[in-house]
């Protein structure tokens, strides 16, 4: 999960090692421009926030699907 609260600022210092179940993910956002490491934060149905690597294909696929919806 990102460190800090967002807003104001949440940053990710590691990424989830496993692919999240597609139907668990309800929203996403890029971490702040103040963060040293690029990351996408996925928000789950249960209200959890999970850090993911934006260069991973599954992350981009989920972002694309969420954007369409």
């Amino acid at each position: 999960a990102p460190m800090g609260s967002d807003p104001p600022t949440a940053c990710c210092f590691s990424y989830t090692a496993r692919k999240l179940p597609h139907n668990f993910v309800v929203d996403y956002y890029e971490t702040s421009s103040l963060c040293s490491q690029p990351a996408v934060v996925f928000q789950t149905k249960r209200g959890k926030q999970v850090c993911a690597d934006p260069s991973e294909s599954w992350v981009q696929e989920y972002v694309y699907d969420l954007e369409l919806n």
Partner: antibody
Framework: QVQLQQPGAELVKPGASVKMSCKAS????????IHWVKQTPGQGLEWIGA????????SYNQRFKGKATLTADISSSTAYMQLSSLTSEDSAVYYC????????WGQGTTLTVSS | DVVLTQSPATLSVTPGDRVSLSCRAS??????LHWYQQKSHESPRLLIK???QSISGIPSRFSGSGSGTDFTLSINSVETEDLGMYFC?????????FGAGTKLELK
Amino acid sequence: QVQLQQPGAELVKPGASVKMSCKASGYTFTSYNIHWVKQTPGQGLEWIGAVSPRNGDTSYNQRFKGKATLTADISSSTAYMQLSSLTSEDSAVYYCARGYGYDYWGQGTTLTVSS
Amino acid sequence: DVVLTQSPATLSVTPGDRVSLSCRASQSVSKYLHWYQQKSHESPRLLIKYVSQSISGIPSRFSGSGSGTDFTLSINSVETEDLGMYFCQQSNSWPHTFGAGTKLELK
């Protein structure tokens, strides 16, 4: 579809300031950072900085600190870049772009600083 | 800051040629290396993201490879519509930086 709309041109006098806009549509504005890039024939593409519309956080290239101020207005899905104390060196094309991969770009605003 | 060095500065090509454009980083940028094409009086357009990932709507003749500090954009059969400037860019660390570009022109 995703669009970033920028005015085509701005003509400003030396010493003045200018505030450029970048209106986003076709996606959730708060999900992506907006980046600003300067292009001049001599210098190529230069990253100015980025703003996070979600919370207003900004990150600047050291070279543009004090020159550029980045903001975002969620209500209008618009990002802004203000450039101050303009000189002829600031004459360039300025682009806004979306996200880490800069997958969408505005058409660019041509800034001319001239008396 | 990460310095990206592109070579050659200019590449003269004949339609049908296979060409390779190089981008070298002064330090590792991991997988966060992207390629853009810019035609005269147009905005840059994303061609390849994250070293080698293709972009919807971009012809399959464009491909990317490399890792760490050494990256290559390949065009396997150049067409006249491919003429223009090509830039690499890293988004691994702030400030994001661009290479100076490679100009693709007709021989």
